[in-house]
């Protein structure tokens, strides 16, 4: 295949820590065109698998708010509107990139940090391990 | 009380794009430790609302690969293992940071972006609009 | 321009509700979360509770009780609080202002024009 | 809770004077503090954001500091403008806790 060469315009990469050292313009674009289906806001209390919204907030990491979900119940909730426990809630978790502030209390220096989160709750079928 | 000013060890801020564009050390820092529950790889299949994980590569973001979920039905699964319609499967969307290379093709310079992934689905009542 | 535009002025009896509205323009509505504070007359600022418009997350000041509900309808970008139940000590200069949940350093920078609510019998 | 107890309640002060407000948090905070000036009638404004940073627009007069327990607001010449009420609120705990307010009056 073609390869590219680097830009000529990139900045200068002179740094000893380059390349694990990056510069990073925090002018976010947002790709959220409105091709995307639109999110409901709503599907927290919707859901056969409800769950609450718990406010995570960090001002030393970006993003600093992070709401994140805890299903409400073990179990599902039934065409009758009562709890199955023949069927379980479980969270839909998620790996994110946040930038935490390094060191403490810079406003112009991060490194890049993994976090898992829980986005919503959805029901699923149990395993049953059986005893022999 | 003794004032602490803000942190003497922060990079310089001379920068014209001050504080817009910030350094950022890309070794991870991975705060998912075995405290948290384990993540399951099958609730894709087990779930009343099922789904599909598909691929997505872009060599100019950072990360290269995120994996993003399709419903695989309008309806959810019931009991009896077939599509119910009366309910509906809806994707679990959250926005999320990714690095995108900018200018292109540049190993050290990024720029901040928001980007709406389905990282899963949940089986929610419709909502039913009456007409009059 | 960013603002945050509040209903009018309300008068209402004890044990009934009150619905102030805050509408924003100017900026991305999901992007910032919208906090409500009040402040009785001759008092200070109290925190009343947060709404995420896009998460449809809330959290409340236990103060409250369960009779304060935060909502927010995206489509016209209009938050809304709703305090129920009404005293007399609920009366007060009600505010909007929104909160950049990216970089929670920017804090509460622009804030709505007050609604008074005053609560007689 | 987190209480914030600002000091002093009340101030009387002259143009061209230095004057510092305090804020304590009831226990140490790995927060940030903001500060907000609110003349009668008017919503309250931002000053300092993030304990040290000054907000848009805000005079250079203004400035910021603490960490822990104890921050400070600081204007180091007052200005006929700035005759106001002062808050601060303690950022990253819940709930967002303001101070009681000082009242910052002309001598």
């Known amino acids: 295949g073609i390869t590219i060469p680097r830009n000529p315009g990139c900045p200068n990469s002179e740094d000893k820590n380059f390349p694990r050292t990056v510069m990073v313009n925090l002018n976010i674009h947002n790709r959220n065109t409105n091709t995307n289906p639109k999110r409901s806001s709503d599907y927290y209390n919707r859901s056969t698998s409800p769950w609450n919204l718990h406010r995570n907030e960090d001002p030393e990491r970006y993003p600093s708010v992070i709401w994140e979900a805890k299903c409400r119940h073990l179990g599902c909730i039934n065409a009758d509107g009562n709890v199955d426990y023949h069927m379980n809630s479980v969270p839909i978790q998620q790996e994110i990139l946040v930038l935490r502030r390094e060191p403490p209390h810079c406003p112009n220096s991060f490194r890049l940090e993994k976090i898992l989160v829980s986005v919503g709750c959805t029901c699923v079928t149990p395993i049953v391990h059986h005893v022999a | 009380g003794i004032t602490i000013p803000r942190n003497p060890g922060c990079p310089n801020s001379e920068d014209k794009n001050f504080p817009r564009t910030v350094m950022v050390n890309l070794n991870i820092h991975n705060r998912n430790t075995n405290t948290n529950p384990k993540r399951s790889s099958d609730y894709y299949n087990r779930s009343t609302s099922p789904w599909n994980l598909h691929r997505n590569e872009d060599p100019e973001r950072y990360p290269s690969v995120i994996w993003e979920a399709k419903c695989r039905h309008l309806g959810c699964i019931n009991a009896d293992g077939n599509v119910d319609y009366h309910m509906n499967s809806v994707p679990i969307q959250q926005e999320i940071l990714v690095l995108r290379r900018e200018p292109p093709h540049c190993p050290n310079s990024f720029r901040l972006e928001k980007i709406l992934v389905s990282v899963g689905c949940t089986c929610v009542t419709p909502i039913v609009h009456h007409v009059a | 321009e960013v603002q945050l535009v509040q209903s009018g002025a309300e008068v209402k009896k004890p044990g009934s509700s009150v619905k102030v509205s805050c509408k924003a323009s100017?900026?991305?509505?999901?992007?910032?979360?919208i906090h409500w504070v009040r402040q009785a007359p001759g008092q200070g600022l109290e925190w009343i509770g947060v709404?995420?418009?896009?998460?449809?997350?809330?959290l409340y000041n236990q103060k409250f009780d369960g009779r304060v509900t935060l909502t927010a309808d995206e489509s016209t970008s209009t938050a809304y609080m709703e305090l129920s139940s009404l005293r007399s000590e609920d009366t007060a200069v009600y505010y909007c202002t929104r909160y950049d949940k990216w970089y929670s350093f920017e804090g509460m920078d622009i804030w709505g024009q007050g609604t008074t609510v005053t609560v007689s019998s | 809770d987190i209480q914030m107890t600002q000091s002093p309640s009340s101030l009387s002060a002259s143009v061209g004077d230095r004057v510092t407000i305090t804020c304590s948090a009831s226990q140490g905070i790995r927060s940030y503090i903001d500060w907000f000036q609110q003349k009668p009638g008017k919503s309250p404004k931002r000053l300092i954001y993030a304990t040290f940073d000054l907000a848009s627009g805000v005079p250079s007069r203004f400035s910021g500091s603490g960490s822990g327990t104890d921050y400070t607001l600081t204007i180091s010449s007052l200005q006929p403008e700035d005759f106001a009420t002062y808050y601060c609120r303690q950022v990253g705990n819940y709930p967002g806790t303001f101070g009681q307010g000082t009242k910052l009056e002309i001598k």
């Open positions: 100017g900026y991305t509505f999901t992007d910032y979360e």
């Open positions: 709404n995420d418009p896009d998460s449809g997350g809330t």
